[in-house]
C-alpha cells in the first residue's frame, strides 16, 4: 500500500486529500497544510517546507483551518443596539453576541446587528409561540376558551381558569379572557348585585 502523502506534496488535479486541513498552492502545484483554528500563516509553504503557523495575538482570532496571513480582529458587542456578549473572544472564536432577553433581532446581516424590545401583549392575549425564538417581534393571539391573561407583558402566558369545584368552592363570577374565575364558599351569600341571578 502507498504511504500516506504528507504536505507539501504534488497534486496534478489541483485537489488535496484533506480539504479541511490542506489547501492547493497553485504557484508550486502542491498541497500544503492549513493552519489550525487560533493560528495564522507566518511563513508560506514551498516545495520543500510546509506552512509555518503562529498563534493569533491577543484580541484577534481565526475560527477555522485556514491559510490566512492575518488573524481577524475581535469585535465587541454593541449594547446600544441591544446586543450583549455571552462569551468573550478567544484565539479560536469570535465574540459571541446575542439579543438581550426580551428583545428580538430586528436587523440581520450574516449575523444580528440590531435588537429591539419585544412588544407587550395586552390582557386577554399571549405571544404566539415561534419555532425560532428571538427572530421576530411578538404576534399576540387571544387566549383560548377557558384561559385568561391579566397583564400587559411580552412573555406572560394565558393560564387556565380556576375550577372552583376542585377547591371545594362554588363559582361567584365566571372567568373571562382577561380575568380568572371568582370563587366563593358555598355557604356565603352571593354579593347583592348578583342576588337576582339565583332564581331558576
Amino acid at each position: 500500500s502507498q504511504p500516506q502523502a504528507v504536505p507539501p506534496y504534488a497534486s496534478e488535479n489541483q485537489t488535496c486529500r484533506d480539504q479541511e486541513k490542506e489547501y492547493y498552492e497553485p504557484q508550486h502545484r502542491i498541497c500544503c497544510s492549513r493552519c489550525p483554528p487560533g493560528t495564522y500563516v507566518s511563513a508560506k509553504c514551498s516545495r520543500i517546507r510546509d506552512t509555518v503557523c503562529a498563534t493569533c495575538a491577543e484580541n484577534s482570532y481565526n475560527e477555522h483551518w485556514n491559510y490566512l496571513t492575518i488573524c481577524q480582529l475581535c469585535r465587541p458587542c454593541d449594547p446600544v443596539m441591544g446586543l450583549e456578549e455571552i462569551a468573550p473572544c478567544t484565539s479560536k472564536r469570535k465574540t459571541q453576541c446575542r439579543c438581550q432577553p426580551g428583545m428580538f433581532c430586528a436587523a440581520w446581516a450574516l449575523e444580528c446587528t440590531h435588537c429591539e424590545l419585544l412588544s407587550d401583549c395586552p390582557p386577554g392575549t399571549e405571544a404566539e409561540l415561534k419555532d425560532e425564538v428571538g427572530k421576530g417581534n411578538n404576534h399576540c393571539v387571544p387566549c383560548k376558551a377557558g384561559h385568561f391573561q391579566n397583564t400587559s407583558s411580552p412573555s406572560a402566558r394565558c393560564q387556565p381558569h380556576t375550577r372552583c369545584e376542585n377547591q371545594g368552592l362554588v363559582e361567584a363570577a365566571p372567568g373571562t379572557a382577561q380575568s380568572d374565575t371568582t370563587c366563593k364558599n358555598p355557604l356565603e351569600p352571593l354579593p347583592p348585585e348578583m342576588s337576582g341571578t339565583m332564581l331558576m
Epitope: P76, C77, P79, E84, E85, I86, A87, P88, Q96, R98, Q100, P101, G102, L118, L129, K130, D131, E132, V133, G134, P154, S155, R157
Partner: antibody
C-alpha cells in the same frame, strides 16, 4: 481578569432592610446586564433581579417585586440591591453575576433574616 | 414564566462513566440555555452556553445538545473533579430561570 466582589450582607430582623453592593472590575461594566442570584443553604440557584447595561430596564422575580430595588452606577462600576421588608425566606447567599447568561460570578455575601 | 425541569435530581456514578442530565423548558427557548457546575462552598462555573457551545477552558468531555424545549448535558467519561451539582438556566426571557439542579455523587 474579571472580578466581582459583593458586600453588605449581615443579620437583619424580619421586616428590616439591607443594601448589598457589588464592585466589578476587569471588564467593560457598562456593556453587560448585571444580575443578583441567591442560594438558600442547601438549596438551588434562584435568579432575583437584573438590570440592563444602561440601567434603563430592571427586572425582578415575582417574590421580591415591590420590596427589592436593583440599580447600577456605570461610572463607578458598581451594582446595588436595596432590600426592604425582608422575610425569613429571603435568607440566602446573594451572588452578583455578569451578563444575562451569567458568564462570571462573585463569591457572594450572606443575608440572614431572623428575630 | 418559563419553568425549567431538570432530571434526575441526583445520580450515583463511577469514574469513567458516561453521565447524561436532561433539562426541559415549559415553552420553547430556542438555544438560549446555559449549563453550570457548582461545588460545595464555591460559586457556580459556566460550562456551556447557547445549548451546545463549550466555554473556554472547559474540558471537551462536557457537551451540550438540544433546542426548543429539550436539552441535554453529557459528561463522556466522568472524572473525580466532576462530582458536583449541575444546573441548567434559560436566558430567552425574563424572569431568568434555573433548573432545580442535579447532584452527581460517587457510587
Amino acid at each position: 481578569e474579571v472580578q466581582l466582589v459583593e458586600s453588605g450582607g449581615g443579620l437583619v430582623q424580619p421586616g428590616g432592610s439591607l443594601r448589598l453592593s457589588c464592585a466589578a472590575s476587569g471588564f467593560t461594566f457598562s456593556s453587560y446586564t448585571m444580575n443578583w442570584v441567591r442560594q438558600a443553604p442547601g438549596k438551588g440557584l434562584e435568579w432575583v433581579s437584573g438590570v440592563a447595561p444602561s440601567g434603563d430596564r430592571t427586572y425582578y422575580t415575582d417574590s421580591v417585586k415591590g420590596r427589592f430595588t436593583i440599580s447600577r452606577d456605570n461610572a463607578k462600576n458598581t451594582l446595588d440591591l436595596q432590600m426592604t421588608s425582608l422575610r425569613a425566606e429571603d435568607a440566602a447567599i446573594y451572588i452578583c453575576a455578569q451578563g444575562f447568561a451569567f458568564t462570571n460570578w462573585g463569591q457572594g455575601t450572606m443575608v440572614t433574616v431572623s428575630s | 414564566d418559563i419553568q425549567m425541569t431538570q432530571s434526575p435530581s441526583s445520580l450515583s456514578a463511577s469514574v469513567g462513566d458516561r453521565v447524561t442530565i436532561t433539562c426541559r423548558a415549559s415553552q420553547g427557548i430556542s438555544s438560549a440555555l446555559a449549563w453550570f457546575q457548582q461545588k460545595p462552598g464555591k460559586a457556580p462555573k459556566r460550562l456551556i452556553f447557547d445549548a451546545s457551545s463549550l466555554d473556554s477552558g472547559v474540558p471537551s468531555r462536557f457537551s451540550g445538545s438540544g433546542s426548543g424545549t429539550d436539552f441535554t448535558l453529557t459528561i463522556s467519561s466522568l472524572q473525580p473533579e466532576d462530582f458536583a451539582t449541575y444546573y441548567c438556566q434559560q436566558y430567552n426571557n425574563y424572569p431568568l430561570t434555573f433548573g432545580g439542579g442535579t447532584k452527581v455523587e460517587m457510587k
